[in-house]
Interface confidence: low
């Protein structure tokens, strides 16, 4: 039977709790393309969904904010789907001398939790 | 004119943006009154707030996530405020041979900005 | 204080479906961590828990309706909304939506709004 | 589902006294993390519902402390020290723990 409160598994239905998601966005979407050349396109992994108890607590001050919610709700916020890591991407950016890579070490999640 | 940099200043007025709380909390409300002794209640500091458009960002990713919020909000949702560091906390355990002291690393927060 | 307030048709006929809307006023609907519920109580009878649903669109539906029933929310207007198809006489009920958290399952209520199944 | 059944179906008090209500799950309330998850309601005369005690035991806020919650597993029970006369109408346990939730049938509180 269905969980009202999460073990391992989202029990608000597959897809609903916090996990990573690719969005697409241009480098117009990002207010970059006057600096930024290539990719025209990019493929941003984010954290999205929700935070049910215990799903995915980061630690343990995240287990304890998602108690504390439930006791005082308007007073202490649910946890919220975070990225736990970050993958590097390459950026082709201007420069005065012509172009150059730089890497981004925080742009793209890599892995989310509920924090 | 566009903000390059995070925004310190709350545009929402005093106390509504990303801050640290101190929130009171009872062994009792934490489920944790079997196991530990002391102390019995604890000042736990948290990270409550909004996070506007650049306040307090944590990195680039959240830079693009307060972006593309903004244009695809049902897709994207806005970056929330949680723990940036944490403060160390000691801990009195009951133990089969008595008592132990124990520091838990990720329980307090100490400072908060908007992923 | 949050308030909530149901409206839709108080007659419904059968075979039809019955749309109900639940207005939140003093709070936001987006606060993360609350989900927005519908309960409805038969006349003279118990409660029943029709489904929930929280601020992103994640519903939970009661497996005894769950083919006949969406719930959805509309942010922008602070509002979250109950659709019922092909109804009977056994669907006669008062309809309450409500506010819970995580430990407080419904700590707000609606005043509740009867609807009635007749042709 | 968990079927709940309360007892008894109707109950006349005195007020000024204590009253009792008996509340019985079909399977256990206790959670992992060491809650029951079992909340009461009072519905007074042509009013909505309203939280009593949520977890077993956590009275809401602004309730009076004259009701307290007790149990655990599969047997709860909602205990009123002094009944006075605004405490009458019919109260519903309801689990939480597994969805969907459940209410047990209600019980009628009238002074005698």
């Known amino acids: 039977s269905a969980h009202l409160h999460p073990r391992d598994s989202c029990p608000l239905g597959p897809g609903r709790c916090c996990h990573l998601e690719t969005v697409q966005a241009t480098l117009e979407d990002l207010g970059w393309s006057d600096w930024v050349l290539s990719p025209r396109q990019l493929q941003l992994s984010m954290c999205v969904g929700e935070c049910p108890h215990l799903y995915r607590s980061a630690n343990t001050h995240a287990l304890i904010k998602a108690r504390l919610h439930g006791l005082q709700p308007d007073r202490v916020p649910a946890p919220c789907c975070v990225p736990s890591s970050y993958t590097p991407v390459v950026l082709m950016h201007r420069t005065d001398s012509g172009v150059s890579l730089q890497t981004y070490d925080d742009l793209v999640a890599q892995g989310c939790h509920c924090a | 004119s566009a903000h390059l940099h995070p925004r310190d200043s709350c545009p929402l007025g005093p106390g509504r943006c990303c801050h640290l709380e101190t929130v009171q909390a009872t062994l009792e409300d934490l489920g944790w009154s079997d196991w530990v002794l002391s102390p019995r209640q604890l000042q736990l500091s948290m990270c409550v707030g909004e996070c506007p458009h650049l306040y307090r960002s944590a990195n680039t990713h959240a830079l693009i996530k307060a972006r593309l919020h903004g244009l695809q909000p049902d897709r994207v949702p806005a970056p929330c405020c949680v723990p940036s560091s944490y403060t160390p906390v000691v801990l009195m355990h009951r133990t089969d041979s008595g008592v132990s002291l124990q520091t838990y690393d990720d329980l307090v927060a100490q400072g908060c900005h908007c992923a | 204080q949050v308030q909530l307030q149901e409206s839709g048709p108080g007659l419904v006929k059968p075979s039809q479906t019955l749309s109900l809307t639940c207005t939140v006023s003093?709070?936001?609907?987006?606060?993360?961590?609350?989900?927005w519920t519908w309960i409805r109580q038969h006349p003279g009878k118990g409660l029943e828990w029709i489904g929930a649903?929280?601020?992103?669109?994640?519903?939970v539906y009661n497996p005894s309706l769950k083919s006949r029933v969406t719930i959805s929310v509309d942010t922008s207007k602070n509002q979250f909304s109950l659709k019922l198809s092909s109804v009977t006489a056994a669907d006669t009920a008062v309809y309450y939506c409500?506010?819970?958290?995580?430990?407080?399952?419904?700590?707000?209520w609606g005043q509740g709004t009867l609807v009635t199944v007749s042709s | 589902d968990i079927v709940m059944t309360q007892s008894p179906l109707s109950l006349p008090v005195t007020p000024g006294e204590p009253a009792s209500i008996s509340c019985r799950s079909s399977?256990?309330?206790?959670?992992?993390?060491?809650?029951?998850?079992l909340d009461w309601y009072l519905q007074k005369p042509g009013q909505s519902p309203q939280l009593l005690i949520y977890?077993?035991?956590n009275r809401a806020s602004g309730v009076p402390d004259r009701f307290s919650g007790s149990g655990s597993g599969t047997d709860f029970t909602l205990k009123i020290s002094r009944v006075e006369a605004e405490d009458v109408g019919v109260y519903y346990c309801?689990?939480?723990?597994?969805?969907?939730?459940?209410f047990g049938g209600g019980t009628k509180v009238e002074i005698k």
């Open positions: 977890l077993g035991s």
């Open positions: 649903i929280y601020y992103s669109g994640s519903t």
């Open positions: 309801m689990q939480t723990l597994e969805a969907p939730p459940t």
């Open positions: 409500a506010r819970g958290v995580e430990y407080q399952h419904f700590n707000e």
């Open positions: 399977q256990s309330l206790l959670h992992s993390n060491g809650y029951n998850y």
């Open positions: 003093g709070g936001s609907i987006n606060s993360g961590g609350y989900y």
